[in-house]
């Protein structure tokens, strides 16, 4: 019986010779559990596992802890890959995180973190980031040191408010912090002075809700 080839991330898929961007099946480390992900094989050398994407507001990102844990949406469009998978993947190997952003005026920018990982669920999928470079701000729009993840039904922020309910979407809220890429999607000309939009402060400032975002990870030794 031939053993099925499994891949833990899009970098392994790329190195296997499959170099076309699209949806692929990934397998949890040390498990048979599978998840479908979008692999970007074109951006900056390829091999990127997309863990978040926003582009048109077609998917509701005001979801529960369980939904953010397991993932939701469609890898061909707007989606969240899942905190549990990303946590397991990044805890066993050194990954970089690239965040690609688009505004409504036709500009693009990115933030690249040279080391990214999520703690496990027992630590509320706390985000850990070091080594910021890129064009989307010299200061990290994800609060440092990293915050715990919060959702509408699991409030783990440092605010007297409930950031996830106030700003919408699950995110690594501080109190509430300079970013929220899972906020409410606003169309062009309705995207300024928003208290709950898709925010990356150190690129576009406060109240500006972005047109598109992609968060993607790749092994640092790719």
């Amino acid at each position: 019986k031939e053993e099925k080839t499994t891949f833990r991330d899009c970098a392994e898929i790329f190195k296997s010779g499959l170099t076309t961007s699209g949806i692929y099946t990934l397998t949890f480390p040390n498990s048979t559990e599978e998840v479908k992900a979008y692999c970007d094989m074109d951006m900056g050398g390829g091999g990127w596992t997309v863990i978040q994407h926003r582009e048109d507001g077609s998917v509701d990102f005001q979801r529960t802890w369980k939904e953010y844990k397991e993932g939701f949406g469609s890898p061909l469009g707007e989606y969240w890959l899942g905190n549990e998978f990303v946590s397991q993947l990044t805890s066993g190997h050194r990954y970089v995180l690239k965040i690609q952003l688009k505004d409504w005026e036709g500009s693009e920018a990115h933030s690249l973190y040279e080391h990214f990982y999520l703690s496990g669920e027992e630590s509320n999928y706390r985000i850990h980031l070091t080594g910021l470079t890129g064009t989307a701000g010299k200061i990290s729009s994800i609060s440092q040191p990293g915050s715990d993840f919060s959702t509408k039904d699991s409030d783990n922020d440092k605010c007297i408010c409930k950031c996830s309910q106030m700003l919408t979407g699950g995110w690594w809220f501080d109190a509430c912090g300079p970013s929220n890429l899972n906020g409410q999607y606003y169309p062009q000309k309705q995207n300024t002075n928003k208290f709950n939009g898709i925010k990356w402060y150190y690129w576009k400032g406060s109240g500006y809700s972005l047109k598109a975002t992609t968060m993607m990870i790749r092994p640092a030794d790719f």
Epitope: C159, D174, C176, G177, F195, K199, S206
Partner: nanobody, 129 residues
């Protein structure tokens, strides 16, 4: 739609006074804190003063304490900044901005600039003889 409109700026001599107004629409002042910020040419935008109407609490930057007074008129949904004893270094574009009053870190009294998500277009204050 949230809108903030500043007015009252202008040219004033050192030692003079001005009163800036920030007319707010689309939100009620009871639920928000309103801050005044300023930005001089080539410098970072900095916080000047802020007010939470619901609790009546106020904040002032050290550089304006004793000279500037912030107040609000909830019936007019307007916040004012009375500026006395003006100095050349007060020259800047002055902006008002809004933040939900509850968006506060445990143990803190005021808000970092990135929490203010709604901004006006600004009004220019020039202090010169």
């Amino acid at each position: 739609e949230v809108q903030l409109v500043e007015s009252g700026g202008g040219l004033v001599q050192p030692g003079g006074s001005l009163r800036l107004s920030c007319a707010v629409s689309g939100i009620t002042l009871d639920d928000y804190a309103i801050g005044w910020f300023r930005q001089a040419p080539g410098k970072e935008r900095e916080g000047v003063s802020a007010i939470r109407s619901s609790g009546g609490s106020t904040y002032y930057a050290d550089s304006v304490k004793g000279r500037f007074t912030i107040s609000s008129d909830n019936s007019k949904n307007t916040v004012y900044l009375q500026m006395n004893s003006l100095r050349p270094e007060d020259t800047a574009v002055y902006y008002c901005a809004a933040v939900p009053a509850g968006r506060l870190r445990y143990g803190e009294q005021w808000y970092p600039i990135y929490e203010y998500d709604a901004w006006g277009q600004g009004t220019l204050v020039t202090v010169s003889s």
